[in-house]
Amino acid sequence: MMTGTIETTGNISAEKGGSIILQCHLSSTTAQVTQVNWEQQDQLLAICNADLGWHISPSFKDRVAPGPGLGLTLQSLTVNDTGEYFCIYHTYPDGTYTGRIFLEVLESSVAEHGARFQIP
């Protein structure tokens, strides 16, 4: 029996060198969120603890900014940032809810060519 639901930004794309906001929202439950962890595949990016606030992993400090809200902002995107991202909500008394986002980082030249292309 699942009580709450995680809504995410789903599959998103962004341009190399740009920034993107990763957002998740927990709904349909009255459970109290005690902590949210953000992971990129097998790496911990950031933690937002209800009492202690935000902690950004040292290896991502230069390119990851907390917020807005419980979301996460990724900056100076590279093609290597393409992949799965997970928001993991720890709640009381329900337990843990996990949402998945797939980010594709596009070469800026691809985006530019795409914008200029016109059908005759």
Partner: nanobody, 127 residues
Amino acid sequence: EVQLVESGGGLVQPGGSLRLSCAASGYTYSRKCRGWFRQAPGKGREGVATLYTSSGGTYFDTYADSVRGRFTISRDNAKNTLYLQMNSLRPEDTAVYYCAARLSTDFCGPRADFDYWGQGTLVTVSS
């Protein structure tokens, strides 16, 4: 196929301690939702404790109100084993304890539906 085998049950006096183990095979996902459940004589099965872990380092444990502060769920990655440390045991903790694993990690808690179950181990708390 996932297989779960519990051990460690037995007879213990009120106020005593016991540690249950659950050896898992075939459950090798990077994100895991595992838990302990129990079924007392003549009652339905209830969630006791669950543990969400990921290869990214996330480790979130959740407990039923009736055991919070007395029971601790943990795991040994190298042995692929789940544990339940039970302290300050009470007669009402008497039950068959089951280890369980869930395929999906969208929700991991004592009220989640689990996919794989062990055969159970009996814990009796009596003087």
